[in-house]
């Protein structure tokens, strides 16, 4: 999947199975990421799960998993909000779009996370307080995590170099990283497609013309529409909404 | 060990900043600072061992001498509200301030700064 | 995640010494008062002590004091327990635990004091 | 020292229904301060002992609703809604508002 980084870096990143995208004192998020046809190196999330810690008297550890064409707007426990404490309202699900869209508060964190099915696979996006964000017991030990510190090096994609090989009428546009592309959906199509929704020709856009060249999957463009669209809504600097090319930085340079 | 709840107290007791009261606040300000001063030595016998007790109790000496507090005095009234009878339902608006970020851990300083992250596609 | 792993413990004789070790990880040792507490085949858990996160101070239960020593190395993210003049009544599971009230324990090492 | 005494020692539960341990102190565990600083224990066979409850009735991260705890000055209580074949093990109070701190004896869980 496509990561935008706490830190406004913007990677692809190949990171298959199990990955924690937030592990903070507060609260822990990992997705599941499987490849997007047979043989891919690019994958798409297909589970998300997010642990609300216990926290002092407003909210009990609550649970909530989302899985392709399972997105519900309730905890594992059935709740929708923060259990039985004093502060329960402060952890808060809404469901936006029955199935598509839910919307998660956690004001006792100064929190807001959206969670979407888009097509086959869920988008992930999360405002959150650099207080939050940097509240790890142990900076060192914290290891990976996607949100801080992006995807390691080797598992990125450099979808600059795969768009170069797409836009080059010598080589087809099915070159790495996937070996089973549809052949239905040249370049040009593509980036119509991506022009509809996205007429800022920002990294949003770039992704959604990868993922159509790599997937064929229509779905895609609106899974960048609405990652563009939740990060108007999160990102708390609009000056900095959209993301424009620059050259890859390595994984330390997020951290 | 509840100190960091006795910190967030704190804070949220002290909206006009724990390092810099206007003049005219410092008599509320001490107060503040001798309710820290209770809530800290409250958590004592579970803390003790830890730095964030000690970090504490160390803060709270430099900011009282630092704003000529005296030890003695009256303290300031906790901002939480009381708990709703044992069978209150689902629905409760009235959670404590510690229950809301930008209410409690922010009232001593300027807004948070809010970041973002995004996961989608492939 | 928190990890406490204890090590050292074996068989010794009555009188004899040994040194357990605590080694912490998934949380900032530094911060953290640490405690040692004990547990006899088939009986209760026995506090034996405890030491501040800088070495400040240490308190001891009765039954230990003068013969064990607790101390802490910060930049190995260690804890270790020094047992002399042991004795029968010694023997037991030694668990280490994080905190100045114990929230995360150790899987425990044995320690038999038999001749 | 502080002597914890808990009840019963044994406790065969059916798998479902309720079950509660009681734990006396020898004296008042009510500190100058008005605090009470009682905590509960559990150790699955073959386990080490995991935090349950601290403050006297508040659940520790990661502990299931089914446990609760109750109580004040020398009599305090742990409560378990709806035993689960995972419960079983041995329960401890362990109170630390006086030094030096002190474990109960035990109450030991089993399933009928």
């Known amino acids: 999947p496509h990561l935008r980084t706490f830190t406004d870096h913007f990677q692809t990143c190949k990171v298959q199975g199990a990955w924690p995208l937030i592990d903070n004192n507060y609260l822990n998020v990992q997705v599941t990421n499987t490849p997007v046809l047979p043989g891919s190196a690019a994958t798409a999330t297909s589970k998300l799960t997010i642990i609300f810690k216990n926290f002092q008297e407003c909210v009990d550890q609550k649970v909530y998993q989302a899985e392709m064409d399972e997105l519900p707007s309730a905890f594992a426990d059935g709740s929708k909000n923060g259990g039985d404490k004093h502060g329960a309202n402060s952890l808060k699900i809404t469901e936006k779009v029955s199935g598509q869209h839910v919307e998660i508060q956690a004001k006792y964190i100064g929190t807001t996370i959206v969670v979407r099915q888009v097509g086959r696979y869920l988008t992930f996006a999360v405002r959150m307080p650099e207080e939050v964000v940097n509240a790890v017991e142990d900076r060192d030990s914290q290891g990976l995590y996607l949100c801080l510190r992006g995807c390691p090096l080797n598992q990125q994609i450099d979808f600059q170099a795969f768009r170069a090989n797409a836009e080059s009428p010598r080589r087809p546009a099915a070159a790495s990283p996937s070996p089973v592309v549809p052949e239905t959906f040249p370049y040009e199509t593509a980036v119509a497609k991506c022009k509809e929704k996205l007429p800022v020709e920002d990294l949003y856009y770039q992704a959604c013309v990868f993922d159509l060249l790599t997937t064929g999957d229509v779905n895609f463009t609106l899974a960048a529409y609405y990652a563009l669209e939740d990060g108007k809504m999160l990102h708390s600097n609009k000056d900095k909404l959209h993301l424009f090319e620059r050259t890859r930085e390595l994984p330390g340079a997020v951290a | 060990c509840k100190i960091l709840k006795c910190n967030s107290e704190f804070w949220s007791a002290t909206s006009s900043g724990s390092h810099a009261p206007a003049s005219d606040d410092v008599p509320e300000f001490c107060a503040a600072l001798r309710t820290y001063a209770l809530c800290t030595r409250r958590t004592a016998r579970t803390c003790r061992g830890d730095l964030a007790y000690h970090s504490a109790v160390h803060g709270i000496e430099d900011l009282m001498s630092q704003h000529n507090c005296s030890k003695d005095g009256p303290t300031s009234q906790p901002r939480v509200r009381t708990l709703p009878p044992a069978g209150d339902s689902q629905e409760r608006s009235d959670s404590p301030e510690i229950c809301h970020y930008e209410k409690s851990f922010h009232k001593h300083s300027a807004a948070p700064n809010y970041t973002h992250c995004g996961l989608f596609g492939d | 995640e928190v990890q406490l792993v204890e090590s050292g413990g074996g068989l010794v004789q009555p009188g004899g010494s040994l040194r357990l070790s605590c080694a912490a990880s998934?949380?900032?040792?530094?911060?953290?008062?640490m405690n040692w507490i004990r547990q006899a085949p088939g009986k209760g858990l026995e506090w034996i002590g405890m030491?501040?996160?800088?070495?400040?101070?240490?308190h001891y239960a009765d039954s230990v004091k003068g013969r064990f020593t607790i101390s802490r190395d910060n930049s190995k993210n260690t804890l270790y327990l020094q047992m002399n003049s042991l004795r029968a009544e010694d023997t037991a599971v030694y668990y280490c635990?994080?905190?100045?009230?114990?929230?995360?324990w150790g899987q425990g090492t044995m320690v038999t004091v038999s001749s | 020292d502080v002597v914890l005494t808990q009840s019963p020692l044994s406790l065969p539960v059916t798998l479902g229904q309720p079950a509660s341990i009681s734990c006396r102190s020898s004296q008042s565990l009510e500190s100058s301060d008005g605090d009470t600083f009682l905590e509960w224990f559990q150790q699955r066979p073959g386990q080490s002992p995991r935090l349950l409850i601290y403050d006297v009735s508040t659940r520790f991260s990661g502990v299931p609703d089914r446990f609760s705890g109750s109580g004040s000055g020398t009599d305090f209580t742990l409560k378990i809604s709806r035993v689960e074949a995972e419960d079983v093990g041995v329960y401890y109070c362990?109170?630390?508002?006086?030094?030096?701190?002190?474990f109960g004896q035990g109450t030991k869980l089993e399933i009928k």
């Open positions: 362990f109170q630390v508002t006086h030094d030096p701190v002190t």
């Open positions: 998934g949380f900032t040792f530094s911060n953290y008062g």
């Open positions: 635990a994080k905190g100045t009230t114990p929230d995360y």
């Open positions: 030491i501040y996160y800088d070495s400040s101070e240490k």
